[in-house]
C-alpha cells in the first residue's frame, strides 16, 4: 500500500514553508527595490543569459544528476527545484543585507540574482549526500542554514581577505562538499534490511542523471565565468573551463573502463567525473595562460574523480551513510581542494616572478581562506545535521529512505513502485 506523509508533517510542511514564504515576501516588500538605471537593453539581455545558464545548471543539471536512485528520482528532481526556488529568494535578501543594507534599501540587479543562484547551487551540491533520507521540511532548514553560512563566509572572506566575487564564490565547491558530508554524518546511517534495493540506480533514472551531467557539462563555463569583472577574464574562464571539462570527459570514460576488471564503464563514475575539470579549474580558470595547462588539469581531475569514485564510496557508506551513487560530496571536496592548490601555485609563481614579499603573505591568506571555508562548512553542517535530527521535523523512518511514495501521489500504483 502506498505510504503517506505522517499527519503531523502534512500539517507542519505547508505551514512552515508558506509562513516562511510570506516572511520573505514581506522582507522583499520593505527592503528591496529594482535597479532603475538600465540604459542598454541589449546589455540587459546578454546579462540575463548568464543567469539563465546558471538556472539551467541548477534546476535541470543538478536536479537530474541526483535522480539516479531506483525509487527516488521524482523526489530528487522536485526537491532540488524547491530548494533552488527558496534558496535564491533568501540568498538575494541575505547578500543585500550583508553588502548593501547600511546604505538603505537592497537594490536588486541581474548580478544579484546571478550571485543568489550560485549561492543556492551550493545547497544542491550538498544535498546530494542526504537526499532520500530527509523530508521537505528538513530541506527547508538545510537551505536556510547553508545559504546563511555561505553568505556570511563570503562576506568575511571579502572583508578580511580582500577577495573579489569570483574568488570568494569559488570556495563553493569545498564549502558545499564538506557541508553536505557533515550533515550526512549526523543523520541515521544504517539501511534496514529489505530496503537496500532502493538506493541502487536504475536504467531510466540513470539516463536522466546522465542528462543532468550533460547539462552541467554544457553550462559549466558559464558558472566559472559568471562573476568575473572583465571580458578578457570571462573569455579566458570560458575557454579554460571548456578545455578542462572536455578532457575530463575523455579521462572519465577511459579511466572508468580501466578501473573495471572487465573494462566496463561505470555510469556512476561517468556522471560525476565528466564535471571534474570544471570544478578543479574553477578558482583559477581566468588566470590559466594557455589551453594545455587547463587540459592537464582536466586530465588530473578526471583521474582523481574516477579514483575517488572507485575507492571512497565504501568508506563513505560506512562512516557517513552515503549511498554509492551519491559521490558528488567527496568528489567536489577533492577537486575543490585541487583547484585551491592550483591557485596557491599561481600565487607562488607571482612571488618568484616579482620577488614580492606581499604575495608570499597572500599565499598564507589564501590558505587561511580555504581553512576558514572548510571550518565554517563543517561547523554549520554539523549544526544543520543536529537540527535535522530534531523530532519536530518527523523525518522519514529508515525503512522509508529513498522512496518516492513517501512524498508523492501515484494514483496508478496500488502496491509497490
Amino acid at each position: 500500500m502506498s505510504s503517506k506523509y505522517p499527519r503531523s508533517v502534512r500539517r507542519c510542511l505547508p505551514l512552515w514553508a508558506l509562513t516562511l514564504e510570506a516572511a520573505l515576501i514581506l522582507l522583499f516588500y520593505f527592503f528591496t527595490h529594482y535597479d532603475a538605471s538600465l540604459e542598454d537593453q541589449k546589455g540587459l539581455v546578454a546579462s540575463y543569459q548568464v543567469g539563465q545558464d546558471l538556472t539551467v545548471m541548477a534546476a535541470i543539471g543538478l536536479g537530474f544528476l541526483t535522480s539516479s536512485f531506483r525509487r527516488h528520482s521524482w523526489s530528487s528532481v522536485a526537491f532540488n527545484l524547491f530548494m533552488l526556488a527558496l534558496g535564491v529568494q533568501w540568498a538575494i535578501l541575505l547578500d543585500g543585507f550583508l553588502s548593501q543594507f547600511p546604505s538603505g534599501k537592497v537594490v536588486i540587479t541581474l548580478f544579484s540574482i546571478r550571485l543568489a543562484t550560485m549561492s543556492a547551487l551550493s545547497v544542491l551540491i550538498s544535498v546530494d549526500a542526504v537526499l532520500g533520507k530527509v523530508n521537505l521540511a528538513q530541506l527547508v532548514v538545510m537551505v536556510l542554514v547553508e545559504v546563511t553560512a555561505l553568505g556570511n563566509l563570503r562576506m568575511v572572506i571579502s572583508n578580511i581577505f580582500n577577495t573579489d566575487y569570483h574568488m570568494n564564490m569559488m570556495h563553493i565547491y569545498v564549502f558545499a562538499a564538506y557541508f553536505g558530508l557533515s550533515v550526512a554524518w549526523c543523520l541515521p546511517k544504517p539501511l534496514p534490511e529489505g530496503t537496500e534495493d532502493k538506493d541502487q540506480t536504475a536504467t531510466i533514472p540513470s539516463l536522466s542523471a546522465m542528462l543532468g551531467a550533460l547539462f552541467l557539462w554544457m553550462f559549466w563555463p558559464s558558472f566559472n565565468s559568471a562573476l568575473l569583472r572583465s571580458p578578457i577574464e570571462r573569455k579566458n574562464a570560458v575557454f579554460n573551463t571548456y578545455y578542462a571539462v572536455a578532457v575530463s570527459v575523455v579521462t572519465a570514460i577511459s579511466g572508468s573502463s580501466l578501473a573495471h576488471p572487465q573494462g566496463k564503464i561505470s555510469k556512476t563514475y561517468v556522471h560525476s567525473a565528466v564535471l571534474a575539470g570544471g570544478v578543479a579549474v574553477g578558482t583559477s580558470c581566468h588566470l590559466i595562460p594557455s589551453p594545455w595547462l587547463a587540459m592537464v588539469l582536466g586530465l588530473v581531475a578526471g583521474l582523481i574523480s574516477v579514483g575517488g569514485a572507485k575507492y571512497l564510496p565504501g568508506c563513505c557508506n560506512r562512516v557517513l551513510g552515503i549511498p554509492h551513487s551519491s559521490i558528488m560530496g567527496y568528489n567536489f571536496s577533492l577537486l575543490g581542494l585541487l583547484g585551491e592548490i592550483i591557485y596557491i601555485v599561481l600565487l607562488v609563481l607571482d612571488t618568484v616572478g616579482a620577488g614580492n614579499g606581499m604575495i608570499g603573505f597572500q599565499v598564507l591568506l589564501s590558505i587561511g581562506e580555504l581553512s576558514l571555508a572548510i571550518v565554517i562548512a563543517l561547523m554549520s553542517g554539523l549544526l544543520t545535521g543536529l537540527l535535522l535530527n530534531l523530532k519536530i521535523w518527523k523525518a522519514p523512518h529508515e525503512a522509508k529512505y529513498f522512496d518516492d511514495q513517501v512524498f508523492w501521489k501515484f494514483p496508478h500504483l496500488a502496491v509497490g513502485f
Epitope: 546579462s47 540587479t109 546571478r114 569583472r229 572583465s230 571580458p231 578578457i232 588566470l287 616572478g353
Partner: antibody, heavy 125, light 109 residues
Framework: EVQLLESGGGVVQPGRSLRLSCVVS????????MHWVRQAPGKGLEWVAV????????YYADSVKGRFTISRDNSKNTLYLQMNSLRAEDTAVYYC??????????????????WGQGTLVTVSS | AELTQPPSASGTPGQRVTISCSGS????????VYWYQQLPGTAPKLLIY???QRPSGVPDRFSAFKSGTSASLAITGLQAEDEANYYC???????????FGGGTKLTVL
Amino acid sequence: EVQLLESGGGVVQPGRSLRLSCVVSGFTFNNYGMHWVRQAPGKGLEWVAVIWFDGSNKYYADSVKGRFTISRDNSKNTLYLQMNSLRAEDTAVYYCARENQIKLWSRYLYYFDYWGQGTLVTVSS
Amino acid sequence: AELTQPPSASGTPGQRVTISCSGSSSNIGSKYVYWYQQLPGTAPKLLIYSNNQRPSGVPDRFSAFKSGTSASLAITGLQAEDEANYYCQSYDSGLSGWVFGGGTKLTVL
C-alpha cells in the same frame, strides 16, 4: 585615438539634480569598465563610482551612495552619472576614466589608463 | 584623502626628487599602488601601475617603490616639463573603492 568627452556640467542649486554624460570613441566601449572621478577646486582627486563593462555591477564612494547613479549605454558608447540631492560639497570637475587591467599569475590589477578633460559642476544657491 | 602625500616638493633641473605616499593595511599594505601626473589645466595621466611598472611612453626617469603601508615616486634627472601635481592611488578594501592621495605639487626651480 582614444577619446572621452564629458558634458552636462553647469551651475545647479542644492537639492536639485544633474545628469552628466561621457561619450567615448577610439576603443570598444563594451569591453571596459568605466569610472567617474571628481576634483574639487584646488583639491585632490576623489573616486566617485565604477560600472562594469556590461553594466551588471556598480560601486559608489560612501560620500555619494544613495544619491548618485552610474549607468551606461553600450549601444551609444556613452557613460552617465545621474546626480540627485546635490550638495555644495559636490562642486568639482567630474572626469570619466577608462578602467584597464594588467595580468599577473594570480590576479588581475585594475587602473585608470585614459581620462576625459572633465566637466565642471557647481552647486550653489 | 585616505592616502597621505606632502602638499609640495621641489627640485632643480637634473636633480632627483622623491614624493612619498602613506596609507594603511587596508589599501597600500595589501593592494597595489598607482601614480598619476596631472599637468596644469589637464586631466590626470597614468605614470606608474602595479607598484613599479611604467606604461609605454613614460620615461624611465620615473620609478616607484613600495614598502609596507608606504610608497614613493622617484624622479631622476628632473626636467621643467615635470612640473605638475602627482597623485598616488590604491584600492581600499575597507571602503570597497579607490582612494587617492591629496596630491603633491612638484615645482622645478
